[in-house]
């Protein structure tokens, strides 16, 4: 249990979603930059 009350399951899921969101934003930014440079 993450804090004695809750499992760490949901916070793990949310952390994974946050990482995916961040990577999507970074990759999206890079793609836009590449298109702009062309």
């Amino acid at each position: 249990h993450s804090d004695g009350i809750f499992t760490d399951s949901y916070s793990r899921y949310r952390k994974q979603m946050a990482v995916k969101k961040y990577l999507a934003a970074v990759l999206g930014k890079r793609y836009k930059q590449r298109v702009k440079n062309k």
Epitope: S2, D3, S9, S11, M17, K20, K21
Partner: antibody, heavy 117, light 112 residues
Framework: QQLEQSGGGAEGGLVKPGGSLELCCKA??????????MCWVRQAPGKGLNWIGC????????DYATWVDAQFTLSRDIDQNTGCLQLNSLTPADTAMYYC??????WGQGTLVTVSS | AQVLTQTPSSVSAAVGGTVTINCQSS???????LSWFQQKPGQPPKFLIY???KLASGVPSRFSGSGSGTQFTLTISGVQCSDAATYYC?????????????FGGGTEVVVK
């Protein structure tokens, strides 16, 4: 440890169509932390559970079910150990029991909202 | 939008019998993040199972979950009168592509 819900119910859960209402949920016996997400679920009379949205106690980031369509807004005050759900432009179809939950593991007792003229 | 289809919508079982409830997801849930809940009339849902097969704290071992991807099952072995309730599955999805969560329609368990 429990979640205490307020707003609506005995405190005036009868709202006229087009009206607004704020439901709040206070964590009791534990402190909200960055590992907690406060989610809201509603249940129309005699029907199933319907996810509304979730807000991070830490960052305040929120996500909503597509059907919500900006009608509802989530907020949180980590210092007050509280999260709230603002309901706007209510219609009779929004009549339901509204539950708050932390990480879908600990649930509030629910607040009945009735929308009727 | 994702859909979680629960079958059957209602099931009757004798005390000591076995109940199986199915939950089919479209699309796949994210990395087996599928939970089960029990709800009795006038009460909030109770957290039973998470990540498809892990038992929540304090839940009797007669409850078990299995499955992955799109197909999940909740089994109650040695059904007791206190198990009469409605059961719901909840899927967690890749939020970037769709809603983060969806509930199944529920299965009413009647104990004879």
């Amino acid at each position: 440890q429990q979640l205490e819900q307020s707003g609506g119910g005995a405190e005036g859960g009868l709202v006229k169509p087009g009206g607004s209402l704020e439901l709040c949920c206070k964590a009791s016996g534990f402190s909200l932390t960055t590992s907690h997400w406060m989610c809201w679920v509603r249940q129309a009379p005699g029907k199933g559970l319907n996810w509304i949205g979730c807000i991070s106690a830490g960052s305040g980031d929120a996500d909503y079910a597509t059907w919500v369509d900006a009608q509802f807004t989530l907020s949180r005050d980590i210092d007050q150990n509280t999260g709230c759900l603002q309901l706007n432009s209510l219609t009779p179809a929004d009549t339901a029991m509204y539950y708050c939950t932390i990480n879908f593991e600990l649930w509030g007792q629910g607040t009945l909202v009735t929308v009727s003229s | 939008a994702q859909v979680l289809t629960q079958t059957p919508s209602s099931v009757s079982a004798a005390v000591g019998g076995t109940v199986t409830i199915n939950c089919q997801s479209s699309p796949s849930v994210y990395s087996s993040y599928l939970s089960w809940f029990q709800q009795k009339p006038g009460q909030p849902p109770k957290f039973l199972i998470y990540e498809a097969s892990k038992l929540a704290s304090g839940v009797p071992s007669r409850f078990s979950g299995s499955g992955s991807g799109t197909q999940f099952t909740l089994t109650i072995s040695g059904v007791q009168c206190s198990d009469a309730a409605t059961y719901y599955c909840l899927g967690a999805y890749d939020c970037g592509r769709t809603d983060c969560h969806a509930f199944g329609g529920g299965t009413e368990v009647v104990v004879k």
